[in-house]
Interface confidence: low
């Protein structure tokens, strides 16, 4: 799953966590990243990258435990790293990429985290202990499970499946702004001695933000944008504003070399080597940067900055962004690419320009109405009542608003015409000497889950239409099929006639058009996140969990879904872990998520599995998982030997002894057996789940899992005095399935 520097997933936690088995695999190029937070009012577990090191913070009651990886091993190298954190029986163990990095005793109390799990970021969680935590993850979580349960299902629209190309894009790959809310944020642009910003711009946008850097003092900023097809730069410092325009047109779809240079004395913008600069009046002084350098778009705070500015700098659409691309970006002489971005929204690696939309001049004079509305409208206060000026025709007596709005009803995933009844005038237009074509609608904020489609040349780009278009069924709402049952459009309505009328109608009134979505039951589907082929080692069993297959149903929770395995039940290889030998022909989505199911291979060619999933009303089409059984191959990974003092004991750890198999995504049982007699000591295994103080027993066999958990040791029992070091040759054989490797 891809996280873009401002996204997160939330996973509820039903009960306090007594044991923790957390497994994450991530990759990122950022030295700071919040990976996971389990949150309670005070108790919490936090995993984050900080300065490229993995830090774990566990607060239980009033105690705080911190574990971290060594400073010399940086994990911000874009390579996938696997983290395993276990907290069992009062002992916490952290390992990264199979190596034990840290362990410590912890209080035995359960971790009370009723606020749930936050993956990749903390969202809007306002807890005091989150001060000073790392930024949200910008990178990939390839896998994340807690106590066997996937934390990456379901994904939200902002967290994408797979690992996005942009995270591995080198500096020579263009930043593609695909709109309409594209944005890339980079570390702050410092301009203390001087600042330079250089890039090659390709766009057809005539109005678009290019760069924004806020200053430390409230209200200070540097802003570069495309204004009426030309570059413009604004520096606001204290009470002084410097405004600069460049005369080279840039909105022609051709590449243009852009350079912005600022120092304490002057500001210069250059397009294709043609510079424009301010005189050396020294009004600029140093702008202390605050926050990130925003490229190609504006966030809410930057938009607010510009909207509040006395020069009315607000672009035509404050929340609109550049449609186009920036190549060869450098900030203060340092190359920057998508990999260095702290945050991106709707970005693409590389340059893919959209075709220019068909333009038409009929609505040209009214471009001013296409500003976007603020983030949140106070719902009941729209539109502001209009108080007509005295001396207007009697038709405007008691007039407060032009339209009576009725909700638009649309089926989920369907379409509905915007009709007269939805936007009915409150007065007789004929009597007011107004024509329907003079009542102009402008969409200032689109719906979250759908598009108002206008069958009028050029109007789609401007999002403008008239009441006559409504009557002629030229405007229809197309729903995108998502599950929310309500939505809204924000419309600014103005009248363009030159007859006497209230001035508020010339200026425009803002209306909310509620959209009511009638839900449709979607059938569930089976998806195979890693492809529909599963490989298993002969004569072994493999867990069947959401990493192998899962149900996707946008309008049913996991609790309501049931899987059926199709085909003959005799010899069916799917079983519940706790009911070995009994075929599981039907199981719940919850059982699948809990890791209760296994595929058991008992010899011969592996049997493919065909499933379907039902939500109680509709069933999915059958889906087949092809299963291939391969012969186990065993290879010694490590066999280092041990050195210990006579009479002492030494644990055998994965660093001393481990084997690798050809298992694919399968945690196979690897059994070691001692095949020869020992001369100087004995091999021992710890009982009772490896609890401190549990007894050690002599053993002739142990599993790799025991080695990983530190439950195997060699005890020197030889009482004799030797003048030289003695060597114990430990003869072992390894078994995986029915495959045996001898003379290890």
């Amino acid at each position: 799953a891809s996280f873009f520097g401002e996204n997160h997933l939330e996973v509820p936690v039903a009960t306090a966590l007594t044991d923790i088995d957390l497994q994450l695999q991530f990759s990122t190029s950022q030295p700071e990243a919040l990976l996971l937070l389990a949150a309670g009012p005070a108790d919490h577990l936090l995993l984050q990258l900080y300065s490229g090191r993995l830090q774990v913070r566990l607060v239980l009651g009033q105690e705080e435990l911190r574990l971290q990886t060594p400073a010399e091993t940086l994990l911000s190298d874009s390579i996938p790293h696997t983290v395993v954190l276990t907290v069992v029986e009062g002992w916490a163990t952290l390992s990264v990429d199979g190596f034990l990095n840290a362990s410590s005793a912890v209080p035995g109390a359960p971790l009370e985290v009723p606020y749930g799990l936050f993956v990749g970021g903390t969202g809007t969680l306002g807890l005091p202990y989150l001060r000073g935590t790392s930024r949200p993850l910008r990178g990939c979580l390839h896998a994340a499970t807690l106590n066997g349960r996937s934390l990456l299902r379901p994904l939200t629209p902002d967290v994408h499946e797979g690992c996005a190309e942009e995270f591995s894009a080198s500096d020579d790959v263009a930043l593609g702004f695909s709109g309409p809310h594209s944005l890339a944020a980079f570390p702050a642009w410092g301009t203390q001695d001087e600042g330079t910003l250089e890039f090659t711009l390709t766009t057809q946008s005539r109005q678009a933000p290019l760069a924004f850097q806020a200053g430390g003092r409230r209200g200070d900023f540097i802003y570069v944008d495309i204004f009426e097809g030309h570059l413009r730069a604004v520096v606001e410092k204290g009470q002084g504003t410097v405004l600069l325009h460049n005369s080279v047109p840039v909105a022609d779809g051709q590449p243009h070399e852009v350079s912005v240079h600022i120092n304490a004395h002057r500001l210069e913008i250059s397009v294709d080597q043609y510079p424009t600069h301010t005189s050396n009046r020294g009004v600029l002084s140093y702008l202390e940067p605050r926050g990130s350098l925003l490229l190609g778009g504006l966030d809410a705070e930057a938009s607010r900055h510009l909207q509040e500015h006395r020069l009315g700098l607000t672009p035509e659409a404050t929340n609109a962004s550049l449609l186009g691309c920036m190549e060869d970006l450098s900030v203060n002489g340092q190359r920057r690419g998508l990999r260095e971005a702290l945050l991106t929204r709707n970005m693409a690696a590389g340059c893919r320009l959209e075709e220019e939309e068909y333009e038409d001049d009929a609505y040209g004079h009214y471009e001013a109405f296409s500003t976007l509305a603020p983030e949140a409208w106070p719902a009941m206060e729209l539109p502001e009542p209009c108080v007509p000026e005295p001396g207007l025709p009697p038709v405007f007596a008691n007039f407060t608003q032009l339209l009576t709005i009725s909700p638009l009803v649309v089926a989920e995933g369907g379409t509905a015409w915007l009709e007269w009844r939805h936007v009915q005038p409150t007065l007789d237009l004929m009597e007011a000497e107004l024509r329907k074509s003079q009542v102009l609608f402008s969409v200032t904020r689109g719906a979250r889950h759908g598009e108002l489609e206008l069958d009028i040349p050029g109007a789609q780009a401007r999002k403008m239409f008239t009441l006559l278009d409504v009557v002629n069924r030229k405007a229809r709402f197309i729903h995108d099929g998502s599950e929310d049952t309500s939505d809204q459009l924000v419309l600014e309505v103005s009248v363009t006639a030159r007859v006497p009328m209230p001035s508020c109608l010339r200026r425009g009134q803002t209306y909310l058009l509620p959209i009511q979505v009638n839900p449709v039951n979607d059938p569930p589907h089976i998806i195979f996140p890693h492809g529909s082929l599963m490989v298993i080692l002969e004569h072994t069993q493999k867990p069947l969990g959401p990493e192998v297959f899962q149900a996707y149903d946008p309008d049913s929770a996991c609790e309501g879904l049931t899987f059926q395995v199709l085909g003959t039940s005799s010899g069916l290889p799917v079983e519940r872990r706790d009911q070995p030998g009994e075929p599981a022909t039907e199981f719940s989505c919850r059982e699948l998520e809990a890791g209760s199911l296994v595929y058991v291979h008992r010899g011969g060619p592996a049997q493919d599995l065909t499933f379907r999933v039902s939500d109680g009303l509709q069933a999915s089409p059958p889906a087949t998982l092809k299963v291939v059984a391969i012969r186990p191959a065993i290879q010694i990974h490590r066999s280092t030997g041990l050195r210990l003092a006579q009479g002492s004991a030494m644990p055998i750890l994965p660093a001393n002894l481990s084997v690798e198999t050809n298992a694919v995504g399968q945690d196979v049982s690897v059994l070691f057996r001692v095949t020869g007699a020992l001369q100087f000591g004995e091999l021992q295994k710890q009982g009772a789940g490896g609890v401190e103080g549990a007894e050690w027993w002599a053993t002739q066999a142990f599993h790799q899992r025991d080695v990983e958990q530190g439950r195997v040791r060699y005890l020197s029992t030889d009482p004799q005095h030797h003048a030289y070091d003695t060597v114990e040759n430990l003869a072992l054989e390894v078994q995986v399935g029915q495959e045996i490797l001898s003379n290890l």
């Epitope: 009033q62 705080e64 435990l65 911190r66 809007t124 306002g126 005091p128 001060r131």
Partner: antibody, heavy 121, light 111 residues
């Protein structure tokens, strides 16, 4: 219960150094930050810095970098602050204060009784 | 650094009346939906004692006569009704960013 016991008053000469101790009891010393705060006679409070005894991690107020050095000994649950190159402006009461983990970066919920340092020739 | 300005510098209030102390920050101390402003009480010869944390939360064991309010840059500590034992110097402190800073203090006398 939580207790922070600081070492006794110190009379030191200008240019010398002084090392103040703060012995903690009643809580997991290595898992809570320890802050140090300065108060000159009749004046307000100034934060010097903090140390996390678990791994020795420190954060300093820039004003005291090079002037104060924070250390901690987990085995004796004791935090130390050394103040060097003493001048008359270093004459003050120095407090240690535990950082409460529930409010990051830690309000100071328990304080030592203070150690008076007097710099005089 | 964030500067905290307390007013008034000293205050004399009659027993049983209300005392109000104000603290203004040079920039916002709000983050993550919280105001990182705290109030301490210090009596002569003693260390400071935490009264209010995160602008309005009463530390355990502190009487409910003490209350805190405010957000962003403007904060208030209110003691109502004042008791004789409340004679002390009160400090506001921010920890929204390092270095942690304290206000200059307000000395409360009881008439």
């Amino acid at each position: 219960q939580v207790k922070l016991q600081q070492s006794g008053p110190e009379l030191v000469k200008p240019g010398a150094s002084v090392k103040i101790s703060c012995k903690a009891s009643g809580y997991a010393f290595s898992r809570s930050w320890m802050n140090w705060v300065k108060q000159r006679p009749g004046q307000g409070l100034e934060w010097i810095g903090r140390i996390y005894p678990g791994d020795g991690d420190t954060n300093y107020n820039g004003k005291f970098k090079g002037k104060a050095t924070l250390t901690a000994d987990k085995s004796s649950s004791t935090a130390y602050m050394q103040v060097s190159s003493l001048t008359s402006v270093d004459s003050a009461v120095y407090f240690c204060a535990r950082g409460n983990t529930v409010v990051v970066p830690y309000t100071m919920d328990y304080w030592g009784q203070g150690t008076t340092v007097t710099v005089s020739s | 650094d964030i500067e905290l300005t307390q007013s008034p510098a000293s205050l004399a209030v009659s027993l049983g009346q209300r005392a109000t102390i104000s603290c203004r920050a040079s920039e916002s101390v709000d983050s993550y939906g919280n105001s990182f402003m705290h109030w301490y009480q210090q009596k002569p010869g003693q260390p400071p004692k935490l009264l209010i944390y995160l602008a309005s939360n009463l530390e355990s064991g502190v009487p409910a006569r003490f209350s805190g309010s405010g957000s962003r840059t403007d904060f208030t500590l209110t003691i109502d009704p004042v008791e004789a034992d409340d004679a002390a110097t009160y400090y506001c402190q921010q920890n929204n960013e390092d270095p942690l800073t304290f206000g200059g203090g307000t000395k409360l006398e009881i008439k």
